[in-house]
Amino acid sequence: LHCPAACTCSNNIVDCRGKGLTEIPTNLPETITEIRLEQNTIKVIPPGAFSPYKKLRRIDLSNNQISELAPDAFQGLRSLNSLVLYGNKITELPKSLFEGLFSLQLLLLNANKINCLRVDAFQDLHNLNLLSLYDNKLQTIAKGTFSPLRAIQTMHLAQNPFICDCHLKWLADYLHTNPIETSGARCTSPRRLANKRIGQIKSKKFRCS
């Protein structure tokens, strides 16, 4: 077990920021509580990449080139508080990716290319306080996707090409009841609703032809 040559390791924090890494370092001390991997050129998060590190509380993978995430990449990380994945090339979240992350409070997925969300994507995230999906490719979100998020306080959904039809009516109702969307998510289509804030549109206007 060692500290990667380019990185610094102290107080159970592994700091590999901007070190030109192309893959997740392996054989790290099992006691680490935080790993900072932002601003590298990592493309793939392989199976069980972080599983040996059961004490991890924060993972920062922002501003890499991640396009592929193994479904069990974060398996078993019951102490994880923050997962920072913004500024990558993620197009989808594999089934069970966040399974068992009961302690997660912050999930930052902004500035990716996510085009759809499984309805059970956030199934175990009962303690999530902030979810950022800002600046992705989401056109719709299935009803019930946010139901498990009992502790959610802030959600960022802006800069997504939302189609405001009958399938998104539930989201307008949800945001009326829970005014937690602070980034100003807007409709892209149909034209009559384009650029209007989803949380401010009357639900009867969400129609399917």
Epitope: R57, R58, D60, N129
Partner: antibody
Framework: QVQLVQSGAEVKQPGSSVKVSCKAS????????VSWVRQAPGQGLEWMGG????????NYAQKFQGRVTITADESTDTVYMDLSSLKSENTAVYYC???????????WGQGTLVTVSS | DIQMTQSPSSLSASIGDRVTITCRAS??????LNWYQQKPGKAPKFLIY???NLQSGVPSRFSGSGSGTDFTLTISSLQPEDFAIYYC?????????FGGGTTVEIK
Amino acid sequence: QVQLVQSGAEVKQPGSSVKVSCKASGGSFRSYTVSWVRQAPGQGLEWMGGIIPIFGTANYAQKFQGRVTITADESTDTVYMDLSSLKSENTAVYYCATGSGWYTFDYWGQGTLVTVSS
Amino acid sequence: DIQMTQSPSSLSASIGDRVTITCRASQNINSYLNWYQQKPGKAPKFLIYAASNLQSGVPSRFSGSGSGTDFTLTISSLQPEDFAIYYCQQSYRSPPTFGGGTTVEIK
């Protein structure tokens, strides 16, 4: 690891406002949560609110809503706490703190004593 | 808001003593309980997270236990540098709230 360095002590008149700064050294905290916690003389700890610098939107305790404003300047890795309409009971040490989640405070600034007195 | 109640509010102990501080939450907070140590004129220091996990660099004589509403901080053998105020804090729901503190004094 991130170290937090706060601005110096302040003496303020009742009714005025105070702006306390908290600067990160030894690493950026742009995607960390930064909270403000206050401690009146001889009293316990009280969370005021927090912010994630990359988003800029803050989260406040109900008690301080409308009177406290927390902002961040990403370019200088500095977070600010502005408290208005000061009263003598706002005399306290104000700490900034950061951690792995919204409500866990791993690292603390050294504290800034704000004295409100006429 | 979730209320956190610590007991005792103060205690006197001798070097080498086993010291136990309890913290009770007004509702179930699972294991979302942190402990801090504060010395006069200093910022609090993070000791234990998630009820029982020692923060890096904290001596192993400190331990935490509990879940739900009842939690305990134990110092197995009190050292001179342990005389301080100890606070519990819930990180389960907003706003995070602290206990009133327990002062550990020299007997």
